[in-house]
Structure formats: C-alpha cells, structure tokens
C-alpha cells in the first residue's frame, strides 16, 4: 500500500482542519487507514482521524482541533495498520481556507435594486470575522454565459446591484464565497446558491 499524492491540509482557523490525499490504488480509506495528529509541544495528546473515501483512490480526513491558535503546529502520521505510509507537519494558521458564508438571501422588494445579504461564517471573537472579503457570483439560469462576479471588499456582508443591470423576466442565481486578506488564504467553498426572478421593468418613458 502506497501514497500516490501526499496529504495536503487546510484549516478553517477555528476547530476543523481537512486533509486530502490519493492512494496508489483503490482503497477503503475508513477501514484501512488512520491519520494520527499531535500538537508539536512537549508530550501533547495524540488524536486519531478516521478518513473517508473521496473518489476511488482519494481519501479525506476532518481533523477536530481544540481551538486553533496561531502558535499551533501539528505532526501528521498516516498509518495503514502497523505500516507508517507518510509523515509530515501542518501549521493551521499558514494554510487557512475560510468557512463558506451562509444564509444568502435576495431582497427584491425595493423596485430598482437587488439587495443580497449573507452571514459572516465566523463569530466576532475570531480574527477572521473582520478580515473577510467576498466574491458574489450571479448568473442567468437560462444562459450560463450571462455570469458575473462582484468583489465585495468592504466588511459588511451585503451587495446592492441595480435591477436594470439584469435582464428582465429572467431567473437568476447567486452564490458567495470568502477569503481573508491578512492570512492570504485560499477562497472558501461557494455558499449554497439562491434563486430569484428579476421582474424589474424599465420606467415607461425609458422604453
């Protein structure tokens, strides 16, 4: 049994880190493999993660961590029974992938504006709460070429767009993702998308 692609890990900078890797052949990850992780300092407790399959040869493990802080560094040992397949280390604060924003809502009650709001995925006591910026993807359900990205570089999780910039009588979808500038993170996953119907009509005199 052999590792084809070594584990790479990302952290939500709160309590969960996710490691993914690929094996040399089809593997029942949960039955055959264990990922052990330990905080690098004195004789910290060793924790065990049971991986799940992620495609035929892929494995993924969700490591639960006790309140990730900037000083934390972990050793990682990938075992197949008594055989050590791979050994590495992981510093969560240097490999941050933010949690995805949630509760994306579209407000169309103001006639000429579409207001999108969503929730910051972090509590205010987490440094990332005030460090996130967002990208909002809006697309036409009937024409995937009619897609746009709005970068939201201010802190408030809202976006206002003129309804007139969207085609009338068309259903649109939106989704949002986040990244943190000070930590030079990767982008989060996209939020679940939300759908709305653009019923905006130009005023009569502009037709």
């Amino acid at each position: 049994m052999k590792v084809l692609q070594e584990p790479t890990c990302v952290s939500d900078y709160m309590s969960i880190s996710t490691c993914e890797w690929k094996m040399g052949g089809p593997t029942n990850c949960s039955a055959e493999l264990r990922l052990l992780y330990q905080l690098v300092f004195q004789s910290s407790e060793t924790h065990t993660c049971v991986p799940e399959n992620n495609g035929g040869v892929g494995c993924v493990c969700h490591l639960l961590m006790d309140d990730v802080v900037s000083m934390d560094n972990y050793t990682l040992d990938l075992w197949a029974g008594q055989q050590l397949l791979w050994k590495g280390s992981f510093k969560p604060s240097e490999h941050v992938k933010p949690r995805a924003p949630g509760n994306l809502t579209v407000h169309t009650n103001v006639s000429d504006t579409v207001l999108l709001t969503w929730s910051n995925p972090y509590p205010p006591d987490n440094y990332l709460y005030n460090d996130l910026t967002y990208a909002v993807n809006i697309w036409n359900e009937n024409d995937l070429a009619d897609s746009r990205i709005h970068n939201v570089t201010y802190l408030k999780p809202t976006l206002r767009i003129p309804a007139s910039t969207l085609k009338s009588g068309i259903s649109y979808r939106a989704r949002v993702r986040a990244w943190a500038q000070h930590y030079n993170t990767t982008w989060s996953e996209w939020s679940p998308s939300t759908k709305w119907y653009n019923s905006y009509r130009e005023p009569f005199e502009q037709r």
Partner: antibody, heavy 121, light 107 residues
Framework: QVQLQESGGGLVQPGGSLRLSCAAS????????LTWVRQAPGKGLEWVST????????LYADSVKDRFTISRDNAKNTLYLQMNSLKPEDTAVYYC??????????????WGQGTTVTVSS | DIQMTQSPSSLSASLGDRVTITCQAS??????LAWYQQKSGQAPKLLIY???RLQTGVPSRFSGSGSGTSFTLTISGLETEDLATYYC?????????FGQGTKLEIK
C-alpha cells in the same frame, strides 16, 4: 469592558503550594484561550502557561511543567493556576492575560493587575 | 524554542526624537510578533500585533514593521508618557517567548 482580577498570591516556603485565581468579566469567557505570564523582580516577562478555550489543551513553560497546573471553570468565568513544589525562582508577579481574538492566543489585549508570589524561607 | 533578541537593552532619547527598537528572532516567525509597553508598577499593554497592526487606542506615533526574523518598533515623536520598558513577543510557535526588554528613558 474586559476585566481580569488575579488573587491568591502571598508568601510561601520553598516546596509549598499556592493556588492563583483570575476572575474574568466583560467578555465571553468560554471562547478564549487564557494565559499566565510572570515577571520576577527587576526582570522581564516570561510566559508560564496557556489553556485553550474548551480546556482540553494545556501548555506549560519547561520551567514549571509537572509542578504547575492551569485550569478553568467556564461556568464561574475563572482561570486558575495551581502551583506546587514552589522554588525561590518562582518569586514573581503573576498576570493573567486574554488575547484580542480567540485565535490569536498570544496577542494579549487585556491583562490583570497582577498578584505577587514570594517563595522564601 | 525560538529566541527573541531585543536591542538595545536600554536607551535614552529626547522628547520629539524618533526612537527605534529592534527584535531579532532565531528563526523565521513570519509576521507573528507583538510589541508591549510596560510602565513601572503596571501591567503590560499591547501596542502592535501581527508585526505591524496598531492596537485600538494606541497613538499613531507607534508603528511596527518587519517580517521573517527582523522586526522594528518605531516611536516617531517621543513623548513623556512613553517612558517605559518595551517587549517583543513571538506568537509563531509554542512556547511563547519574549524579548528581554528595552528600557526607554527620557533625556
């Protein structure tokens, strides 16, 4: 506003024990890692111990490991430091400190006023 | 353990002077560095975190710079109330380690 109030310091003989407390208010106590830092007379600052928010992880300086125990009671909003087998070199002002953010555990935005521990025969 | 070496250990400067204190780490700590001010008989006070981010309420004459192994705390125009000892602290890895301190006196 955040308040941290240490107590429990005093004069103790070498080999003796003390239990320091730090009563906290003004923030969600259970969300933050908390730390003890000490300062010997006329000397610099020294990290002593940190306990993570949920209490499952405790970390110690080599100079106090196996003698000191950090703990917390999230219901009482109180941090503790049980100090056993005390040595003269443990003589210091002991501060409890709270970080600015829950995941920046060393950027201490709030400090108590300190409690003095003197180890002498 | 990461060693933090501060220099100078003490310095004397005049009001209005630009004052620079440096902190050298024994290995790279990225930008995981904080600066503290401690006045006589008081608890320390956070000035700078993340190497360069000014803590709320700290006068703008204080600034921090550097990354990797070399860091600087600058006071752009010294004032009487800045009489204190200044400490750097690395928050990159356990154990947390402070610099030995720089005692700032007013000429």
């Amino acid at each position: 506003q955040v308040q941290l109030q240490e107590s429990g310091g005093g004069l103790v003989q070498p080999g003796g024990s003390l239990r320091l407390s730090c009563a906290a208010s003004g923030f969600t106590f259970s969300s933050y890692s908390l730390t003890w830092v000490r300062q010997a007379p006329g000397k610099g600052l020294e990290w002593v111990s940190t306990i993570k928010a949920r209490g499952g992880t405790t970390l110690y300086a080599d100079s106090v490991k196996d003698r000191f125990t950090i703990s917390r009671d999230n219901a009482k909003n109180t941090l503790y430091l049980q100090m056993n087998s005390l040595k003269p070199e443990d003589t210091a002002v002991y501060y409890c400190a709270k970080p600015l953010y829950s995941n920046l555990a060393g950027d201490f935005g709030s400090w108590g006023q300190g409690t003095t521990v003197t180890v002498s025969s | 353990d990461i060693q933090m070496t501060q220099s100078p250990s003490s310095l004397s400067a005049s009001l209005g002077d630009r004052v620079t204190i440096t902190c050298q780490a024994s290995q790279s700590i990225s930008s995981y560095l904080a600066w503290y001010q401690q006045k006589s008989g008081q608890a320390p006070k956070l000035l700078i975190y993340g190497g360069s981010r000014l803590q709320t309420g700290v006068p703008s004459r204080f600034s921090g710079s550097g990354s990797g192994t070399s860091f600087t705390l600058t006071i752009s125009g010294l004032e009487t109330e800045d009489l204190a000892t200044y400490y750097c602290l690395q928050v990159y890895s356990w154990p947390l380690t402070f610099g030995q301190g720089t005692k700032l006196e007013i000429k």
